[in-house]
Amino acid sequence: KLLQVSTIAMQQQEKLIQQERALLNFTEWKRSCALQMKYCQAFMQNSLSSAHNSSPCPNNWIQNRESCYYVSEIWSIWHTSQENCLKEGSTLLQIESKEEMDFITGSLRKIKGSYDYWVGLSQDGHSGRWLWQDGSSPSPGLLPAERSQSANQVCGYVKSNSLLSSNCSTWKYFICEKYALRSSV
């Protein structure tokens, strides 16, 4: 009789452990759901606030007409700068006009002062032609002022209100550019 009672007690205890385990799993599952819900709500809020503000440029980017610009706070070589911009869904700055050049140099003066900033301009090793990264040629007024004496690949950068050239492997700040979002109003 005593053996029977102890067997039942052990079975009950086993059941209790299983229930506790199930409860723990359920609590964990509930916590996971709550966390997912939080992310989902955050995403929804972000989307809604973006829709309300319809901000054409991301935070910390500067807008001018149809473009958004990001001025880096780190130095890197030209190729790494390009990679950094691509990760943001942008490319190194491509200056299309004198007006855009003036805006950029004016903004840089306000933000940082007279530093070097890589732009998306590089010199073809064979022909010596300057080309933007999309393969187009810069307008005559937007060619680097001095030819770099480097035997290595040569890339373009902005300093003060000039476009200059340097060995692509030197370290500089950089400027990314992407299209501004059009407001759908």
Partner: nanobody
């Protein structure tokens, strides 16, 4: 996780053409840019061409005027049309996506397995 499937590599004569395709699949929140990189034996992997989600395009100096990158956003596919191929273009070509897997994750590089392009007579 983002999966990238390349196709279109092969053996071609100098001056010939090839078209590479890369389809992105899997679960991801957004893709900021897709592109092609290549690695020749004994050399570092280098960017060939890339296209951002906004449609901006980047080419390596060595391929400007010969290669054209394009995309089909609806299919999450990127293409590389390679014309006037040279022996220097011989390499393994890798598809790349700069993507965020979720709303809270940072943008990371995802890579395909690579497809061999050999330019030889």
């Amino acid at each position: 996780q983002v999966q990238l499937q390349e196709s279109g590599g092969g053996l071609v004569q100098p001056g010939g053409s090839l078209r590479l395709s890369c389809a992105a699949s899997g679960r991801f929140f957004r893709v900021n840019a897709m592109g092609w990189y290549r690695q020749a034996p004994g050399k570092q992997r280098e960017l060939v061409a890339a296209i951002t989600n906004g449609g901006q395009i980047v080419y390596a100096d060595s391929v400007k005027g010969r290669f054209t990158i394009s995309r089909d956003s609806a299919k999450n596919t990127v293409y590389l049309q390679m014309n006037s191929l040279k022996s220097e273009d011989t390499a393994v070509y890798y598809c790349n996506a700069k993507a965020a897997a979720s709303y809270v994750s940072t943008v990371a590089d995802y890579w395909g397995q690579g497809t061999q392009v050999t330019v030889s007579s």
